[in-house]
Interface confidence: low
């Protein structure tokens, strides 16, 4: 039968920032440069993340914690822990294989990321367009025409700032 170990694993005494070195009688050795261990009892240290290319260092690696990256200007983070960088576009644009392209008429994007989305169809909710949409902004839906019958409190739509679907370049 297999005898259970009554002695505590000596590696469990090794704190974060060290590893249990089997080559040195399980002595707790400091993590080598560019590596870390974030918990105690580790038998190896993990290699630090390198922020390279479009990534830049937000937090340096230490013996107990990994480096953290963000994205160089003109790009933004995606994914857990900024695992990805995506190119920024202007509002009113979306990213395609051939770079940033203006939103097609009838669509908008109010952010520097993501894709152009269709304007809201106010009539589906029985409402009217209060403010026309642009490449950067969705339409604003107002009360339905029936709500604007004589005697009801009227709403004067503000003049659109620019022609629908056109953005200043």
């Amino acid at each position: 039968f297999e005898r259970t170990r009554s002695l505590q694993d000596p590696c469990s005494n090794c704190p974060a920032g060290t590893f249990c070195d089997n080559n040195r009688n399980q002595i707790c050795s400091p993590c080598p440069p560019n590596s870390f261990s974030s918990a105690g009892g580790q038998r190896t240290c993990d290699i630090c993340r390198q922020c390279k290319g479009v990534f830049r260092t937000r937090k340096e690696c230490s013996s107990t914690s990994n480096a953290e990256c963000d994205c160089t200007p003109g790009f933004h983070c995606l994914g857990a822990g900024c695992s990805m960088c995506e190119q920024d576009c202007k509002q009113g644009q979306e990213l395609t294989k051939k770079g940033c392209k203006d939103c097609c008429f009838g669509t908008f994007n109010d952010q520097k990321r993501g894709i152009c989305r269709p304007w809201t169809n106010c009539s589906l909710d029985g409402k009217s367009v209060l403010v026309n949409g642009t490449k950067e902004r969705d339409v604003v839906c107002g009360p339905s025409p029936a709500d604007l019958s004589p005697g009801a409190s009227s709403v004067t739509p503000p003049a659109p700032a620019r022609e629908p679907g056109h953005s200043p370049q």
Partner: nanobody
Framework: EVQLLESGGGLVQPGGSLRLSCAAS????????MSWVRQAPGKGLEWVSS????????YYADSVKGRFTISRDNSKNTLYLQMNSLRAEDTAVYYC?????????????????WGQGTTVTVSS
């Protein structure tokens, strides 16, 4: 861990050629579109070329069209960029990039993994 490792950069005279390679690991290479992006000294990142997952569709920036050819060997998990008729303005660090799948169709993409880059210097 997803990794991209570029090689093949170097010093070349104007009019010369270079072939860049990008060895991919840690993901199913044949499932993803790939790109080459470059950064000239003191300038921003510039998209150079993309290739779809199968290798059937390729895309090029106007500045390299007719001179550069992107290709891939899915059996070797490797992306290539054949650069001919090189010019001084092609001097840059060239990055291999894996494209993610955040868009709604093939016309949208993002880059989610970058290599460390390989330097191409075109000078006489």
């Amino acid at each position: 861990e997803v990794q991209l490792l570029e090689s093949g950069g170097g010093l070349v005279q104007p009019g010369g050629s270079l072939r860049l390679s990008c060895a991919a690991s840690g993901f199913t290479f044949s499932n993803y579109a790939m790109s080459w992006v470059r950064q000239a000294p003191g300038k921003g990142l510039e998209w150079v070329s993309s290739i779809d997952a199968s290798g059937g569709d390729t895309y090029y920036a106007d500045s390299v069209k007719g001179r550069f050819t992107i290709s891939r060997d899915n059996s070797k998990n490797t992306l290539y960029l054949q650069m001919n008729s090189l010019r001084a303005e092609d001097t840059a660090v060239y990055y291999c990039a894996k494209e993610g799948s955040h868009g709604t169709d093939d016309s949208h993409y993002d880059v989610d993994v970058w290599g460390q880059g390989t330097t191409v210097t075109v000078s006489s």
